[in-house]
Amino acid sequence: AGVFELQIHSFGPGPGPGAPRSPCSARLPCRLFFRVCLKPGLSEEAAESPCALGAALSARGPVYTEQPGAPAPDLPLPDGLLQVPFRDAWPGTFSFIIETWREELGDQIGGPAWSLLARVAGRRRLAAGGPWARDIQRAGAWELRFSYRARCEPPAVGTACTRLCRPRSAPSRCGPGLRPCAPLEDECEAPLVCRAGCSPEHGFCEQPGECRCLEGWTGPLCTVPVSTSSCLSPRGPSSATTGCLVPGPGPCDGNPCANGGSCSETPRSFECTCPRGFYGLRCEVSGVTCADGPCFNGGLCVGGADPDSAYICHCPPGFQGSNCEKRVDRCSLQPCRNGGLCLDLGHALRCRCRAGFAGPRCEHDLDDCAGRACANGGTCVEGGGAHRCSCALGFGGRDCRERADPCAARPCAHGGRCYAHFSGLVCACAPGYMGARCEFPVHPDGASALPAAPPGLRPGDPQRYL
């Protein structure tokens, strides 16, 4: 057991341009308070969980009224530490969320109004019993400076607060196998006092006075081996005569988990899965209700209709998680259509649209040809957010304004000569070839591979390409 302590040193404008406006005014005096939420571990799953290590709310700070025209200074802070007691071992790695709240003290109907000013979060490694760790976190234009530490409550000591210490019985040294309790060198690590008679080889305890058996052993003092021979009933008393023993009550029998926690057996003991709002080894630490203000980022707390939902946070847009502590990456849903670029501005989403598209989600395909004329008889063709012109013969370019050289691409085959013509091009074919592009050979006997040439044109004459 122990206490996590958080000391807020300052909350005010961060460095750099764009200093925030003071949150209080002469017309609307206000005061600050802070919330801290702690979760064990560094894993991403922790984001979805409630404040399983605990949460705390500071006292209200002094009332503050902005001096007209003055920049926002460091704001007056509440006195004292924020303390989050923990009953079990200190996990060593933890996640935190610290929120700065403003309480407006104007003439609101129904009492003071609260609003969230800033929220910072992080993941840290911290050994219990160590010195204060200092931190600076920024949230928008605000800066929060704070220190934190975890300390064990006597008689627990150690980096996880799991070792117990007792005053020395002898002045010079500790008993056999027991170390001095650093940093309390005048104390000795105390052995856990298990239930009297508990087998030292086959039993162990995590709490004073208990006796838990290692696998293969049973009985109140873990002195009876579990027989592997066939026994009639799955659970029941042992038979001293046959030596057949079935396991005694399992660690989950009678469900040691309080407050609706469910029990699962582990190799050495049991584990409770607690409903939301409860935590601790046996779910005995009642957690969190709406009165504790568990919803971050302005989430609305309502009481749940089910024991597994002790409270429910209705999150504002942009946040999710059982405590509204997780910022939604709304762009991951790819809301911008037609290749638009998504920008999450916090208070809103914006889509930056590609050329040819418009609308809040780039959903409107602009009429690419509207107001676009293609010159010289060209026709406009829409497509892909851009327009293009299909030009009449003899013209080219984006808007068909350029006169094309139809011979530039050397369209006449087999050495034919190309002549530009007002309506296109004409190929004068080399001897032995014919066709609009001189693509057909003339047969040696004078017969053409094509139908008879039109009247007035002999094979070998220039053919006009129509």
């Epitope: 469910s262 309502v302 009481g303 749940g304 209709a305 089910d306 024991p307 597994d308 002790a310």
Partner: antibody, heavy 117, light 109 residues
């Protein structure tokens, strides 16, 4: 909108068996505990059974009147809730409802189970 | 096993305020009982009105409100309407077991 649709009711003889199903849509079924509630003709409501979610090891709870005869189960992959009813008695005759509690109570339309000789 | 008790019947007039209560045999009703209120109209038509003691369901008129009054859970209808005539059940959770009251038949004359 949350939808709960019960099926599987019918006429059965005493000591017989019946399996009720409840198809759930429009919410994250896997996250929540689910319940069966019944109402006998002309009577009030009686809670029958509850099953919690995977993170609570699918723990089950029953009213004393149905313990050891009824089994509640769920298939998260199909968003289905079931109630296997064995050794039915005449007093089990009732309308059976699939019920989900979260911020308030969500009800299905019910399925009628009649136990009669 | 806990017993949950409700008034068997109440009569009110349109526009009047009426309060239905829900008592637990185990002691005071608290928020950890997650009191729920359900309305039953003819043909087995059930509607969840209130969850978690005071959490009104969407679409339920604002005249319905839930609270704890003394050691009981309460459903208050402020300005009853003729369409509010129905049977009202309260349900209380005791750990993972749910117990319903016998229901209150509300008549709006």
């Amino acid at each position: 909108e949350v939808q709960l649709v019960e099926t599987g009711g019918g006429l059965v003889q005493p000591k017989g068996s019946l399996k009720l199903s409840c198809a759930v849509s429009a919410f994250t079924f896997t996250t929540y505990a689910m319940n069966w509630v019944r109402q006998a003709p002309g009577k009030g409501l009686e809670w029958v059974a509850r099953i919690r979610n995977k993170s609570n090891n699918y723990a089950t709870y029953y009213a004393d009147s149905v313990k050891d005869r009824f089994t509640i189960s769920r298939d998260d992959s199909q968003s289905m809730l079931y109630l296997q009813m064995n050794n039915l008695k005449i007093e089990d005759t009732a309308m059976y409802y699939c019920v989900f509690y979260y911020d308030y109570v969500y009800w299905g339309q019910g399925t009628l189970v009649t136990v009669s000789a | 096993q806990a017993v949950v008790t409700q008034e068997s019947a109440l009569t009110t007039s349109p526009g009047e305020t009426v309060t239905l209560t829900c008592r637990s045999s185990t002691g005071a009703v608290t928020t950890s009982n997650h009191a729920n209120w359900i309305q039953e109209k003819p043909d087995h038509l059930f509607t969840g009105l209130i969850g978690g003691t005071n959490n009104r369901a969407p679409g339920v008129p604002a005249r319905f409100s839930g609270s704890l009054i003394g050691d009981k859970a309460a459903l208050t209808i402020t300005g009853a309407q003729t369409e509010d005539e129905a049977i009202y059940f309260c349900g209380l959770w005791y750990s993972n077991h749910l117990v319903f009251g016998g229901g209150t038949k509300l008549t709006v004359l």
